[in-house]
């Protein structure tokens, strides 16, 4: 059987703060817990949830939570149920409500020395007590002529005079707190000789030079006085006008006239009404001058066909607030159909290519007129003019590939190259009219091209094969002067290219046949062992059946390599001693010797006093420095090729001897004794 | 002992609702949940919901809400499931039980033109 | 909701053996699985709830094992009379879900 331990009970509440309504069954098995409501299943809300088998509350609504809760459990596998003891919340609570006139019916209805009543709706539980307040006074009972009742929510006076009137509010409290009136009752009752309002001015707008009129009436027994003053609180009458007011009249019904109204009439009107007794009753108006600023410019727009598009007009400012239209063509635009006007905004719906145009923004009030043009472009899909087509084109020379559109706006053509966009540099330019020149066809420009034409609307592409058309040409072209080391193997290589692969043959310079000893293999020009008589001018001839045929001047020079017959020797000499570094070189033609030392070639003819290079190649340092320390290089050249080598000079303090060093004593290091 | 005697077969047209009984005796009828389920080849099955016969709420799966509508008549110990707007996936016996203990008979429902 | 998933949905046996029948849930449902034998003509009988606790009346060689998604029904020494449809079917929440369902017959 199913047994609650803990079961639900009663208990007060306060609106809007958490509760709880606790169960907790014990059952053999898995029990079902549920909550009913006046015996309808309560569903979780964020505000009400079950929390284990209580029932939690996050905050107590008095009309939601008000009713009788019971906790249901139910054992699935018998299906008995069990349910708890009732419980219900006594919620306390209090709301704000306004003060309204209970009697008489109407505002209208009120007149002195009749009774008023005064209700008020602050509601709660438990029954709050009530206190009345006129003008922030508390109020008590039976004081000034009036009835209070606190237990009551109405205050009632009678009679009710002029001295009543004033601002009535009220508050209440309870046990769950405290709440004042959310709108509160003026009573206003009037004594006949106080200055009452019959017409009061209103704000005028005018345009400059513009006639403005104020309208002011009060009525009291006996008649009040009106009187007009203006900012500088100049009182304004038909005798004495101020003398920015000339054109000022004050009419037997108290409305004020303004003729020609200027800028300096802009501003505060005040018309003044003062019965035998009571307070004066001041009304004011103001005076503005109209004013139109001019309007912000429009960006062209573009836009695509089929789109729905709005252009916003900003009016400008102005007082009073301009009214904005559309206009096309001279025609106001409707605020219906397909373009049309909505609010400020032009409306384009499923736009046509016969939108184009300019549209006019027009903003208008007393002060004038202002216009702004907005042009409207309906972008097209670009058409062909003409494509690119597959083209073939000389090496060396300029080629051109064509991409004539037409479109608008007009398009804009970008050119691809094997799926890569093409930046324009020196070798590439993008005409304006979507031409691509390819300045110095090269070879592997021979691939796809692919240009691209594009508008808002849309875009078109075509791509063409681009076929190079080779020169006939050396690859690489000879070098005109080579040199052959005497007695060894040579090679002399001659290739080229062209649309049909070429022939290539040598020949010597005169004329002659080569000997035997030399074969042309292929464009290969070989030497087994080179002679002194190989030396002389040959010509690579190569030639194809569609070009011809070219040349290519060759000198060959037979030569005795370098050798170094004596190298510099890694040198340590004393500071102030001089240095010597040998060095010799032997080739044909003889070779010329050059010096490097730290870096920078010792030219001979700027050495100085310190410096000198022999004939036969050899450098000597006078007087050598530690800044002279330092890696020193021979190179030897001649026409057919270079050599060099190299060594370190180090240039050291000289030591003190020691007395146990005999005179003869070697140095700790080998030099050169100078 | 506990019985639980449900009504007949039904055949019906589509669109038409039908409204199925079951009679519980040998113990007090307000004292237990009274659950219904369907049975179909398709399905196996599916639990349509429970009816507390004390107060009459119900608590039904989301599945069936809308076409099933659990009644009780405590006065004759008599639990009701009425289907609405009747299709061929429909077509199925449909079982009351009390708790997991006790079951019905069943009720054959075939929907058919 | 839970799914549940039965395992064999058909099995064939001979009497005096022991089978045994799986079901797992799609997300743990503590030990509140219950066990049913549905017959012709007769009305489906509750062997096993609470996924071991056996229902009153029923014989001893029915059994029930298991606990969060994994549950087992075990027949030992079938009897010519259990060979019938067994349904498993999860008592954690609403709505109660079922297997599909396993058919034992005789081989």
């Known amino acids: 059987a199913i047994v609650f331990i803990k079961q639900p009970s009663s208990q007060d509440a306060l609106q809007g703060r958490r509760a709880l309504l606790r169960c907790e069954v014990e059952a053999p098995g898995l029990v079902h817990v549920y909550w009913l409501l006046d015996g309808a299943p309560v569903q979780d809300t964020e505000r009400r949830f079950t929390q284990g088998s209580s029932l939690s509350f996050a905050a107590v609504d008095r009309l939601q939570d008000s009713g009788t809760f019971q906790c249901v459990a139910r054992d699935d596998v018998t299906g008995e149920e069990a349910r708890s003891a009732n419980a219900s919340f006594n919620i306390k609570w209090i709301e704000a409500g306004p003060v309204v006139l209970k009697h008489p019916a109407s505002e209208a209805e009120i007149q002195p020395q009749t009774q008023v009543t005064l209700r008020c709706h602050i509601d709660g539980h438990p029954r709050p007590t009530y206190q009345w307040f006129r003008d922030g006074t508390p109020l008590s009972d039976g004081q000034s002529n009036n009835t209070v009742s606190s237990k009551e929510r109405n205050l009632t006076l009678r009679p009710a005079g002029p001295e009543h009137s004033g601002l009535y509010s009220c508050c209440a409290h309870n046990a769950f707190g405290q709440a004042c009136s959310s709108q509160n009752f003026t009573l206003s009752i009037a004594d006949e000789s106080f200055a009452r309002v019959v017409l009061a001015p209103q704000d005028v707008i005018v345009a400059r030079n513009e006639e403005a009129m104020f309208h002011c009436q009060f009525s009291a027994q006996p008649p009040p006085n009106l009187q007009w003053l203006f900012e500088d609180e100049t009182p304004i009458t038909n005798r004495s006008r101020p003398p920015h007011l000339r054109r000022a009249t004050v009419f037997a019904n108290g409305s004020l006239l303004l003729t020609q109204v200027r800028p300096r009439n802009a501003g505060v009107y005040r018309c003044i009404g003062q019965g035998q007794r009571g307070p004066p009753v001041i009304l004011e108006a103001t005076l503005h001058l109209a004013e139109i600023e001019d309007m912000p410019l429009f960006e062209p727009r573009v836009f695509t066909a089929g789109s729905e598009e709005r252009v916003t007009c900003l009016p400008p400012k102005g007082l009073p607030e301009p009214s904005v239209w559309w206009e096309h063509a001279g025609v106001r635009l409707p605020t219906h159909g397909r373009v049309y006007q909505k609010g400020h905004e032009l409306v384009l719906a499923s736009i046509a290519e016969s939108d184009a145009g300019v549209y006019t923004c027009h903003a208008a009030n007393l002060a004038g007129q202002r216009r702004q043009d907005v042009n409207i472009t309906v972008a097209t899909v670009p058409t062909w003019l003409k494509k690119p087509q597959d083209s073939q084109l000389e090496e060396g020379k300029p080629g051109y590939l064509h991409c004539l559109t037409q479109a608008t706006p007009k398009p804009t053509v970008v050119w691809y190259r094997n799926q890569m966009l093409i930046s324009e540099d020196s070798r590439f330019e993008v005409f304006k009219n979507g031409t691509l020149r390819i300045n110095n066809v090269e070879v592997y420009d021979g691939t796809w091209y692919r240009c691209v034409s594009s508008t808002p609307a849309g875009s078109i592409e075509a791509q063409a094969r681009v076929q190079v058309l080779e020169k006939l040409k050396f690859t690489p072209p000879p070098q005109p002067q080579q040199c052959m080391e005497f007695d060894k193997e040579a090679t002399v290589p001659c290739s080229a290219t062209g649309r049909e692969k070429p022939t290539i043959k040598w020949e010597r310079a005169d004329g002659s046949s080569l000997p035997e000893w030399v074969t042309d293999n292929a464009g290969t020009l070989h030497f087994a062992r080179v002679t002194r008589d190989d030396a002389g001018n040959y010509t690579c001839i190569a030639s194809n059946g569609p070009q011809g045929q070219i040349r290519a001047h060759v000198q060959l020079t037979v030569a005795v390599f370098i050798t170094f017959k004596v190298e510099p020797e890694r040198t340590t000499v004393y500071q102030g001693h001089t240095a010597l570094l040998q060095c010799e070189a032997q080739g044909d033609p003889k070779p010329l010797i050059q010096w490097k030392g730290k870096d920078r070639i010792l030219d001979p003819t700027k050495l100085g006093p310190r410096m000198h290079i022999f004939q036969n190649g050899s450098l000597v340092i006078h007087d050598v420095a530690p800044e002279d320390s330092g890696r020193y290089t021979c190179i030897a050249g001649n026409s057919c090729n270079i050599k060099h080598t190299e060594a370190p000079l180090y240039v050291v303090d000289k030591p003190v001897p020691e007395e146990s060093e005999g005179p003869g004593s070697p140095p700790p290091y080998k030099m050169i004794q100078t | 002992q506990v019985q639980l005697q449900q009504s007949g077969a039904e055949l019906v047209r589509p669109g038409v609702s039908v409204k199925i009984s079951c009679k519980g005796s040998g113990y007090t009828f307000t004292d237990y949940g009274m659950h219904w389920l369907k049975q179909s080849h398709a399905k196996s099955l599916e639990w349509i919901g429970v009816i507390s016969p004390y107060y009459g709420d119900v608590t039904y799966n989301q599945k069936f809400k809308g076409k099933a509508t659990m009644t009780v008549d405590k006065s004759s110990s008599t639990a009701y499931m009425e289907l609405a707007r009747l299709t061929s996936e429909d077509s199925a016996i449909y079982y009351c039980?009390?708790?997991?203990?006790?079951w019905g008979q069943g009720t054959s429902v075939t929907v058919s033109s | 909701d839970v799914q549940i998933t039965q395992s064999p949905s058909y099995l064939a046996a001979s009497p005096g053996e022991t089978i045994t029948i799986n079901c797992r849930a799609s997300q743990s449902i503590s030990k509140y699985l219950a066990w049913y034998q549905e017959k012709p003509g007769k009305t489906n009988k509750l062997l096993i709830y609470?996924?071991?606790t056996l229902q009153s009346g029923i014989p001893s060689r029915f059994s029930g094992s298991g606990s969060g998604t994994d549950f087992t029904l075990t027949i030992s020494s079938l009897e010519p009379e259990d060979f019938a449809m067994y349904y498993c079917?999860?008592?954690?929440?609403?709505?109660?879900?079922f297997g599909g369902g396993t058919k034992l017959e005789i081989k």
């Open positions: 039980a009390r708790g997991m203990g006790y």
């Open positions: 079917q999860q008592h954690n929440e609403y709505p109660w879900t």
């Open positions: 609470s996924g071991s």
